[in-house]
């Protein structure tokens, strides 16, 4: 330096040579080696930038600084000897820091932590895998919802933390042999109804569902106010009873009593009580037509209303009733006559014979249930000679066809009226409450008593009237043969039916009436 | 031949519970409602409630409902009554019998004496 | 609830006599039954459905009535039949009995 001066206006980071020239500080370089202009700056050299001499050596990070530079290990790496900064490879002493070793919590749960040369992984558990916005944070995988499809259509997946498991869907089990939860589960459905895991009332009849089961009326049975059918907790009531009253507009004091027996033995009725309600109701019923009482005085059209009523209740009743027995073949017989005859069955494929002390009834099995129906199937033929009082002077309608056949071979209707009642009136019920037209005839013979010579013999059914009373009928029921005591008749449907005769002189020998037994 | 067999004379103490059972024979045991009726000494017969073994309904007169208890176990044939909260007045011979409406109660078991004494 | 009224409540009666007795009902009933009761026994059933007689009952009981009233006959006594006689409606719920008429030895 000149003992002549040194130059004041020497720019930042320089110091000045002589009076007239600057030079930069160590560290900092200008554009020309000696500065002559206070113009000129001196600005800082990045002795870390590529083409720089300085190498700290491996596993560091040169640090650039104003005027000078750092070497300081890379992280995940410290020096050995301790210091933080150096200035050269040879001064580097870096190597590779465990922080596996020094944070065993470094990975949280479901992971584990692997060093690697200047960091560390997380390698997640099966199960798990790397959160992506927090690579070190293993979470659950869904593998219910990831698409994989783990498990097998009978099952569903149920993810747990971790790991997730096949359970049969609820009404399902494994199949004999496989687990119940790894993914090689194979499930089927059980059978609640047979197994007896169901919770139907015993109002209803089980139906079993895949993976599940539903609870239906009993036949003849309703569900209970508000409450729907086929549901899980469907309650219902029986119908057998409620619709059962006093004919409208029929006064009789025996007939409300006889209805207040009905009505009672509804009111507890269960199906185990089916039989002995049966009998009671039948037993009721002899009674009530061995002393009508006050029914004897009302008007005739008014007693065939209440018969007709009665029939058609009956009818109802005994085949709502029926369902509910054990299968077997029931003979029930009263004092004034009344008889029953019931046989209930598995569906069978055979004919059925019903044989009572007055009549026979023969029909096809496969007419009984309807199809779709789980019931068993039932027939039933009921006698019920005391209706006899009742359906006095009943009428008897005749499809035009018939009626003019009787006048061509008869001279007539005789003056004294209505036909005679030979034989019991008897009911035919089936389980199937469809009976308008049988795919089968169903075929009836009566014994009766002796046939007035020259009158002719029909066969005939009640046919309920709009009116809610009705009048003998012979649509659809044929006279296939008749003997003085005995006649057989086929019908093509089924309803109550007797044997009449008519009050027709016949001319002649009349070969219809022959005997065809 | 139809058999109600009840169980031993109880002695209780007021306040406390006891549970009688009729055990039915030579019937379809859910063919019947199952009544039970009590006798208080001297005094005529008191209807208690009936058990349906068919499928559980029970009935009870209101003097007991919520105090007595009918029950019946279809696999072994036997219905039960439990009274609850025994009062002295409860001392009487309890009866269990097969019931039907149109029937009445045809048959009757032997009585279980109940002693309510403290 | 059907409350049953027998009277009379104690009546007395020789072996020969014709005995009646009768059950009223505050509502209409149509199923009457009547049970016979003796001391320290069990009752038994004895009349049902107004008048049908039980198994082993003989015929000198019978029974009758409607609605309201109900009455219950022995044609002739016999020393046998002195006992406690209840009727039983099971019409309505609840169930109930009649308090009894007691029949004693003249």
């Known amino acids: 330096q000149d003992s002549r001066g040194c130059a004041r206006w020497c720019p930042q980071d320089s110091s000045c040579v002589n009076a007239t020239a600057c030079r930069c500080n160590p560290g900092f370089s200008s554009f020309s080696e000696i500065i002559t202009t206070p113009m000129e700056t001196c600005d800082d050299i990045n002795e870390c930038a590529t083409l720089s001499k300085v190498s700290c050596g491996k596993f560091s990070d040169c640090w650039n600084t104003e005027g000078s530079y750092d070497c300081v290990c890379s992280p995940g790496y410290e020096p050995v000897s301790g210091a933080k900064t150096f200035k050269n490879e040879s001064e580097n002493t870096c190597q590779d820091v465990d922080e596996c070793q020094q944070n065993p919590r470094l990975c949280k749960s479901y992971g584990t932590c692997v060093n690697t040369l200047g960091s560390y992984t997380c390698q997640c558990l099966p199960g798990f895998k790397l959160k992506p916005e927090d690579p070190k944070l293993c979470t659950d995988v869904n593998e219910c919802t990831s698409g994989q499809n783990p498990c097998h259509s009978s099952t569903h997946c149920l993810n747990n933390v971790g790991s997730y498991q096949c359970r049969c869907r609820p009404g399902w089990q494994p199949i004999p042999g496989s687990p119940n939860g790894p993914n090689n589960t194979v499930c089927e459905d059980v059978d609640e109804c047979s197994s007896g895991q169901h919770q139907c009332d015993s109002s209803t009849v089980c139906f079993n569902t895949v993976g599940s089961y539903s609870c239906r009326c009993r036949p003849g049975w309703k569900p209970r106010h508000g409450i729907p059918n086929n549901q899980k907790d469907t309650v219902c009531e029986d119908m057998t009873f409620s619709t059962w009253t006093p004919p409208p507009g029929v006064h009789s004091q025996t007939l409300s009593r006889f209805f207040d027996k009905v009505q009672d033995l509804g009111r507890d009725y269960k199906p185990g009580l089916a039989n002995n309600t049966i009998q009671s109701i039948l037993q009721a019923l002899d009674e009530l037509l061995e002393a009508p009482g006050d029914l004897e005085t009302l008007p005739r059209l008014q007693q065939h209303c209440v018969a007709s009523h009665l029939l058609d209740g009956l009818e109802d009743v005994l085949r709502g009733l029926s369902k509910n027995l054990s299968n077997g073949l029931l003979n029930f017989s009263y004092p004034a006559g009344t008889e029953l005859s019931l046989e209930v069955q598995k569906q069978v494929d055979r004919s059925v014979t019903l044989r009572q002390n007055q009549a026979v009834m023969q029909l096809d099995w496969n007419q009984a249930q309807k199809s779709g129906d789980p019931g068993p199937s039932v027939v039933g033929l009921v006698s019920i000679p005391g209706m006899g009082k009742l359906l006095a002077e009943a009428p008897l309608v005749l499809e035009p066809e018939k009626q003019m056949l009787l006048h061509e071979t008869h001279q007539g209707l005789l003056q004294d009226g209505s036909p005679i009642l030979l034989s019991d009136v008897i009911s035919a019920f089936l389980s199937n409450n469809d009976t308008q037209n049988l795919s089968s005839p169903v075929t009836f013979t009566f014994s009766h008593r002796s046939v007035i010579p020259r009158q002719k013999v029909l066969c005939v059914f009640w046919e309920h009237g709009q009116n809610g009373c009705g009048h003998w009928a012979t649509t659809g029921c044929s006279t296939i043969g008749t003997r003085d005591t005995s006649t057989i008749c086929r019908c093509t449907h089924l309803s109550s039916f007797a044997v009449l005769m008519a009050h027709y002189d016949v001319q002649e020998e009349d070969p219809v009436l022959t005997v065809i037994t | 031949q139809v058999q109600l067999q009840q169980s031993g004379a109880e002695v209780k103490k007021p306040g406390a519970s006891v549970k009688l059972s009729c055990k039915a024979s030579g019937y379809t045991f859910t063919n019947y409602w199952m009544q039970w009726i009590r006798q208080a000494p001297g005094q005529g017969l008191e209807w208690i409630g009936a058990v349906y073994p068919g499928d559980g309904d029970t009935r009870y007169t209101q003097k007991f409902q919520g105090r007595a208890t009918l029950t019946a176990d279809t696999s072994i044939s036997t219905a039960y009554m439990e009274v609850s909260r025994l009062r002295s007045d409860d001392t009487a011979v309890y009866y269990c019998?097969?019931?039907?409406?149109?029937?009445?109660?045809?048959?009757w078991g032997q009585g279980t004496t109940v002693t309510v004494s403290s | 609830e059907i409350v049953l009224t027998q009277s009379p409540a104690t009546m007395s009666a020789s072996p020969g006599e014709r005995v009646t007795m009768s059950c009223s009902a505050s509502s209409s009933v149509s199923y009457m039954h009547w049970y016979q009761q003796k001391s320290g026994l069990s009752p038994k059933r004895w009349i049902y459905?107004?008048?049908k007689l039980a198994s082993g009952v003989p015929d000198r009981f019978s029974g009758s009535g409607s609605g309201t009233d109900y009455t219950f006959t022995i044609s002739r006594m016999e020393p046998e039949d002195f006992a406690t006689y209840y009727c039983?409606?099971?019409?309505?719920?609840?169930?109930?009995f009649g308090g009894g008429t007691k029949l004693e030895i003249k």
């Open positions: 019998a097969r019931g039907f409406t149109a029937y009445g109660m045809d048959y």
């Open positions: 039983q409606q099971w019409s309505s719920n609840p169930l109930t």
């Open positions: 459905d107004t008048s």
